[in-house]
């Protein structure tokens, strides 16, 4: 007898993993045999689609390799022409073992910055993500957090954060581990022990000591008066990320020695500097009686400034006056490289004439000071802004007392050309006279385009530099 179709086994929800087999059963009793059709989300499934298998005359629908997109509602409809068609529906829930879609990568990070190690996952149910550092689960704290995305964020990275990390994605179906990655924490070069300044006798041996640290371990270079150290021996040792450099010198002249620690972070460098002065005892004591002699200037620095064949006063309180005074000019001259184009020629003229003073030969060779008017012209017109900075540093004791020649001349204490025209020296480069005084640039135009350089600061009377940091 004909019998209308009855679905004896209604469809159930099927959970399946990606790439697994999923089967829906729609057992039907009827006579004659029914035609069974299947739909997914109300769209007819083509029964000859090779992704599906139909068995038992359509009563079994098998998805041979489940994909994410197979998720949905599946319905079977049975019809044999007797009575109405019958339908049963069930859901396919595509489950997925955890999969790490964006694994972490090795990271080099500078101490104090923020590091983010990615760990993006897929899975159904949504995997929970945790992290392992070394062999232990990583604990979150105020600096370290696992983001909603699964990524690990470390604020204000510290040296102790360095190590091996891996993320773990877990759900009810399984666990996925990322490969182990390395977090390397780099630290800017920093000077732990700055070289100390020394006041020694001529011909002494002095060892300057400079200790620095950083990750990677920095290299130390020594600079003497702005140039690479030309003499002396350097010994270095490295232990526990600390580099120790010792520069041994045979002292024949005063100098400024700078220890520069440098390390590299990717394409950039970090640098720390510390400096010390070596002065020679009795080298620069002011003499009540002018001990010295007149001689033609044979140096290089002031060649363009001093008159050709000019007689200059060489101070015999220095063991080697020519060398010493040239060094003083050279050191100061280097500091003038960054002043404004308006100020620089005037300052250079003042500096050379201040250190290599014009000499009046006679029974007692006498230095001739610069005329007050020329000094004031430099101070108030050409280098007004720079002068203020220099004076301020002098008053705050930022220039050491022994290097008085480098300090700014006190214009008010210099003789005026109006008192005795022969008692003071003029600065021919400034062409200073009443007629062309109006050619001096106005005060406003004397502002330097670059601030005066930060000259080394001092602690007590010895010349030293606090470590400074820079990235280039």
């Amino acid at each position: 007898l004909p019998k209308a179709p009855v679905i004896t086994t209604p469809l159930e929800t099927v959970d399946a993993l990606v790439e697994e087999v999923a089967t829906f059963m729609c057992a039907v009793e009827s006579y004659p045999q029914p035609e069974i059709s299947w739909t997914r989300n109300k769209i007819l499934i083509k029964l000859f689609d090779t992704r599906y298998s139909i068995r038992e005359n359509g009563q079994l629908l098998t998805i041979l390799s489940v994909e994410d997109s197979d998720d949905g509602i599946y319905c079977c409809t049975a019809n044999n022409g007797v009575g109405g068609a019958v339908e049963s529906c069930g859901a396919l829930q595509v489950k997925m073992k955890p999969k790490i879609t964006r694994p972490p990568i090795n990271v080099k990070i500078i101490e104090g910055l923020k590091a983010v190690l990615p760990c993006t996952t897929m899975g159904n149910p949504k995997p929970s993500v945790s992290w392992i550092k070394g062999d232990s689960p990583l604990r979150e704290n105020s600096r370290i957090a696992v983001l909603e995305s699964g990524s690990l964020r470390i604020h204000n990275v510290q040296k102790e954060d360095a190590g091996q990390y891996r993320c773990v994605a877990k759900n009810s179906l399984g666990t996925a581990y990322s490969k182990v990655v390395k977090l390397e924490v780099e630290v800017f070069a920093r000077i732990l022990r700055a070289p100390e300044s020394h006041n020694v006798t001529f011909g002494s041996f002095v060892t300057l000591h400079c200790t620095a640290t950083g990750i990677p371990v920095p290299t130390i270079t020594w600079i003497e008066n702005g140039n690479a150290v030309s003499s002396g021996s350097i010994q270095e040792s490295v232990k526990d990320r600390v580099i120790d450099s010792r520069l041994q010198l045979f002292i024949t002249k005063p100098g400024l020695y700078t220890c520069i620690a440098t390390n590299k972070h990717g394409e950039k460098f970090s640098t720390a500097k510390a400096a010390a002065t070596i002065s020679i005892a009795e080298w620069s004591k002011p003499q009540k009686d002018n001990k010295g002699y007149c001689a033609q200037y044979r140096g290089e620095v002031c060649n363009a400034v001093l008159a050709k064949d000019a007689l200059v006063f060489l101070n015999t309180s220095y063991a080697d006056p020519e060398e010493a005074q040239e060094l003083l000019v050279h050191t100061a001259w280097n500091e003038l490289k960054v002043v404004s184009p308006v100020c620089r020629p005037a300052a250079e003229a003042l500096l050379c004439n201040h250190i290599f003073q014009e000499c009046s030969p006679g029974v007692v060779p006498t230095p001739i000071p610069i005329c007050r008017e020329y000094c004031l012209a430099v101070k108030e017109l050409f280098c007004a802004k720079e002068w203020l900075v220099m004076e301020e540093k002098t008053h705050r004791g930022l220039y050491r007392s022994e290097m008085h020649l480098l300090s700014v001349p006190e214009c008010s204490k210099l003789p005026s050309m109006h008192w005795d025209p022969t008692a003071c020296a003029r600065l021919p480069h400034l062409d200073y006279n009443k007629e062309n005084l109006k050619t001096f640039p106005p005060m406003t135009s004397s502002k330097p385009s670059v601030d005066i350089p930060n000259l080394p600061s001092s602690s007590s009377s010895s010349f030293s530099v606090s470590p400074t940091y820079s990235m280039t």
Epitope: V14, E20, V21, T23, Q33, I54, R55, E56, Q59, T62
Partner: antibody, heavy 121, light 107 residues
Framework: EVQLVESGGGLVKPGGSLRLSCAAS????????MHWVRQAPGKGLEWVSS????????YYADSVKGRFTISRDNAKNSLYLQMNSLRAEDTAVYYC??????????????WGQGTLVTVSS | DIQMTQSPSSLSASVGDRVTITCRAS??????LNWYQQKPGKAPKLLIY???NLQSGVPSRFSGSGSGTDFTLTISSLQPEDFATYYC?????????FGQGTKLEIK
């Protein structure tokens, strides 16, 4: 009583062909899915192929795909397995089995006695 | 394909013993699991279908359980005629894979 009787086995050289038959009786053959299952000497059971009641759907094990063909003749109550390009590893007893699907998942509720196929040079 | 793994491969037991054979599927197969018994030189015989349903004419000392991936065939009290090879089979996918078999021998 359900009865399945296989025939057509024998000795064949590698690369040769053979056609197995399975005669069915005692049930309405035309309404059942049918299968071939084989068993190599001293080994376990291996499903080979299946065919739906009206020959609409045919399935094969990967090991025989492209070499074996399953067919049926409902008028003659017969199931066939055409085996081409035979290999030594096809040596086995071949069983035909009825697929019963009611009140539960598919299962092979009736089996023939088997026919031996030997592939050897 | 779905792989079926049976354990143990062989088993020695005595008449009257309670015996358990397990079968594990490589993925979830709901209850699409059948158990067969085969004696030397004979065709396999269906014992249990749908993981736990006893086939008509099979003694009640045979029982099956499990769902998903792990299944068990239990013989509550071994009889002399029960010494044979037992196979599990999945019918969830159209490849109808069998386990490798468990040979039950007399101790």
């Amino acid at each position: 009583e359900v009865q399945l009787v296989e025939s057509g086995g024998g000795l064949v050289k590698p690369g040769g062909s053979l056609r197995l038959s399975c005669a069915a009786s005692g049930f309405t053959f035309s309404t059942y899915t049918m299968h071939w299952v084989r068993q190599a000497p001293g080994k376990g059971l291996e499903w080979v192929s299946s065919i739906s009641s009206r020959s609409a759907y045919k399935y094969y094990a990967d090991s025989v795909k492209g070499r074996f063909t399953i067919s049926r003749d409902n008028a003659k109550n017969s199931l066939y397995l055409q085996m081409n390009s035979l290999r030594a590893e096809d040596t086995a007893v071949y069983y035909c089995a009825r697929d019963f699907f009611q009140l539960g998942p598919p299962r092979f509720d009736s089996w023939g006695q088997g026919t031996l196929v030997t592939v050897s040079s | 394909d779905i792989q079926m793994t049976q354990s143990p491969s062989s088993l020695s037991a005595s008449v009257g013993d309670r015996v358990t054979i397990t079968c594990r599927a490589s993925q979830r197969i709901s209850s699409f699991l059948n158990w067969y018994q085969q004696k030397p030189g004979k065709a396999p015989k269906l014992l249990i279908y749908g993981a736990s349903n006893l086939q008509s004419g099979v003694p009640s000392r045979f029982s099956g359980s499990g769902s998903g991936t792990d299944f068990t065939l239990t013989i509550s009290s071994l009889q002399p005629e029960d010494f044979a090879t037992y196979y599990c089979q999945q019918s969830y996918s159209p490849s109808y894979t069998f386990g490798q078999g468990t040979k039950l021998e007399i101790k």
